[in-house]
């Protein structure tokens, strides 16, 4: 067990041109707060996926009012650290999302309004117990500077918070086979209480005799790496030989436990073990009250007058989630036309149009031939949002700039030989054939099939095709 700590140092305009407008004004003063979401491993999951390692919300920062004419400075920040307690081992690799939210303090009906100013995300390696790590992330024209660390809660120590320490029983040294607990030299490493043979690198225990595995390892002693392929066995405990984890319809699938709770199957259902500060059947209840303003995007908070009673956010249309933090997928209605790609930016829908189309919903079919010339006498043909050149004889390519090889398509039939010519092509027919493309057989008696050979040309002579 331990705590991930995040210290925000500054949030303001980044370097370079295009400084962002101040998020607050004299008419609409506002204040900032931050949300951090942690996930184990180097996952690149969507922002809406569960914060399996935990999440935290900062206090509100001081009220800020823009000074007219002044450039947007670094904005005043909330006091204190953001702390995300973790109950199990620290995974060592993790993904984070840090969101900067603006709370407008104008005269909105229904209380203050929240909007997301910036979201940064990253994937990092971090050992528990190490020094503060500094980071700078940019989101658009904004820049966020912050530090973070993971520290173990006593009696846990180590880079994963899996070793246990106890005060020394003797003042001078630790017991036989036990080392001093760095950095707590006045404490000793506790005797091993895990199941015999439990991997010291990939397993840990919180109760005597157990062996719980870190992410990516399985088996009774956490010695088998998890493989996600070649898993053909029925659902059940992971195979100690193949290390396969087979998804199936178990009560813990999809982790019904919210807020970083861990799920364990029971004979009849499931049970959530909640991180500190959360409780309820699915860890859905927290010590947060409506007074803390937990509902985002104009959600209405009901109940939760004290930390022991749950609050419920009634979300406005277009938002959902326990804190109205998730936007409904408006792009599923496919508002973009002509194959445009829909992007839900929160404040608006945007369409990224395919070539040849324009407009807010890609509704305008551009005149593809406007301003486009086809070379060498070609003519421009419009169609399907893409311009095409119909090229004059002897030319090809997108803009008719390439001299075509008229023989490339093997136009001479029946083994005739093709010769390129300035006016087109010429076929030299094999014996027994004639015609511009050697398409007509010559009858054995010398007569040919229609049409007759032109005067002055014998069968077998090269036929010029114009």
């Amino acid at each position: 067990a331990g705590v991930f700590e995040l210290q925000i140092h500054s949030f303001g305009p980044g370097p370079g041109p295009g400084a962002p407008r101040s998020p607050c004004s004299a008419r609409l003063p506002c204040r900032l707060f931050f949300r951090v979401c942690l996930k184990p491993g180097l996952s690149e999951e969507a922002a809406e996926s569960p914060c399996a390692l935990g999440a935290a919300l900062s206090a509100r920062g001081p009220v800020y009012t823009e000074q007219p004419g002044a450039p947007a400075p670094d904005l005043p920040l909330p006091d204190g650290l953001l702390q995300v307690p973790f109950r199990d081992a620290w995974p060592g690799t993790f993904s984070f999302i840090i969101e900067t939210w603006r709370e407008e303090l104008g005269d909105q009906i229904g209380g203050p309004a929240w909007s997301l100013l910036a979201r940064v995300a990253g994937r990092r390696r971090l050992a528990a117990g190490g020094p503060w790590a500094r980071d700078i992330q940019r989101a658009g024209a904004w820049e966020l500077r912050f530090s973070y660390r993971a520290r173990c809660e006593p009696p846990a120590v180590g880079t994963a918070c899996t070793r246990l320490c106890r005060p020394r029983s003797a003042p001078s040294r630790c017991g036989p086979g036990l080392r001093p607990c760095a950095p707590l030299e006045d404490e000793c490493e506790a005797p091993l209480v895990c199941r015999a043979g439990c991997s010291p690198e990939h397993g840990f225990c919180e109760q005597p005799g157990e062996c719980r595995c870190l992410e990516g390892w399985t088996g009774p002693l956490c010695t088998v790496p998890v493989s996600t392929s070649s898993c053909l066995s029925p659902r059940g405990p992971s195979s100690a030989t193949t290390g396969c984890l087979v998804p199936g319809p178990g009560p813990c699938d999809g982790n019904p436990c919210a807020n970083g709770g861990s799920c364990s199957e029971t004979p009849r259902s499931f049970e959530c073990t909640c991180p500190r500060g959360f409780y309820g059947l699915r860890c859905e209840v927290s010590g947060v009250t409506c007074a803390d303003g937990p509902c985002f995007n104009g959600g209405l908070c009901v109940g939760g007058a004290d930390p022991d009673s749950a609050y419920i956010c009634h979300c406005p249309p277009g938002f959902q989630g326990s804190n109205c933090e998730k936007r409904v997928d408006r792009c599923s209605l496919q508002p973009c036309r002509n194959g445009g790609l829909c992007l839900d930016l929160g404040h608006a829908l945007r369409c990224r149009c395919r070539a040849g189309f324009a407009g807010p919903r890609c509704e305008h079919d551009l005149d593809d031939c406007a301003g486009r010339a086809c070379a060498n006498g070609g003519t421009c043909v419009e169609g399907g949002g893409a311009h095409r050149c119909s090229c004059a004889l002897g030319f090809g390519g997108r803009d008719c700039r390439e001299r075509a090889d008229p023989c490339a398509a093997r136009p001479c039939a029946h083994g005739g030989r093709c010769y390129a010519h300035f006016s087109g092509l010429v076929c030299a027919c094999a014996p027994g054939y004639m015609g511009a493309r050697c398409e007509f057989p010559v009858h054995p008696d010398g007569a040919s099939a229609l049409p007759a050979a032109p005067p002055g040309l014998r069968p077998g002579d090269p036929q010029r095709y114009l």
């Epitope: 408006r330 209605l333 036309r337 919903r361």
Partner: nanobody
């Protein structure tokens, strides 16, 4: 400002039918896309059926063959005919529309929702 007004929700037995209506009014130049979403208790909101920006119809897999969406362009109204209703169709049904306003801007609007309950 644009308003979407839903009607037609209610309680029905499994196998029964309901017809939802959604009328759009206000400073509308044109309706680009319009349809129905639903939000079952404790779950995410999802698209049920709609007319896309290209004018084609789109249905959720779970309602294909049972629900039919139709529209009356003159009245800026869409309808959702729901047949062979099941318990899992119980939800608040929301009308949604992507509208081009008189000032040529596009905005996405939601109705307030109408409750459909399917129970024996």
């Amino acid at each position: 400002e644009v308003q979407l007004v839903e009607s037609g929700g209610g309680e029905v037995q499994p196998g029964g039918s309901l017809r939802l209506s959604c009328a759009a009014s206000g400073s509308i130049f044109s309706i680009n896309a319009m349809g129905w979403y639903r939000q079952p208790p404790g779950k995410q909101r999802e698209l049920v059926a709609g007319f896309t920006g290209d004018g084609s119809t789109k249905y959720a897999e779970s309602v294909k063959g049972r629900f039919t969406i139709s529209r009356d362009n003159a009245k800026n109204t869409v309808y959702l005919q729901m047949s062979s209703l099941r318990a899992e169709d119980t939800a608040v049904y929301y009308c949604a529309a992507d509208v081009q306003l008189l000032n040529s801007d596009y905005e996405f609007y939601w109705g307030q929702g109408t409750l459909v309950t399917v129970k024996p």
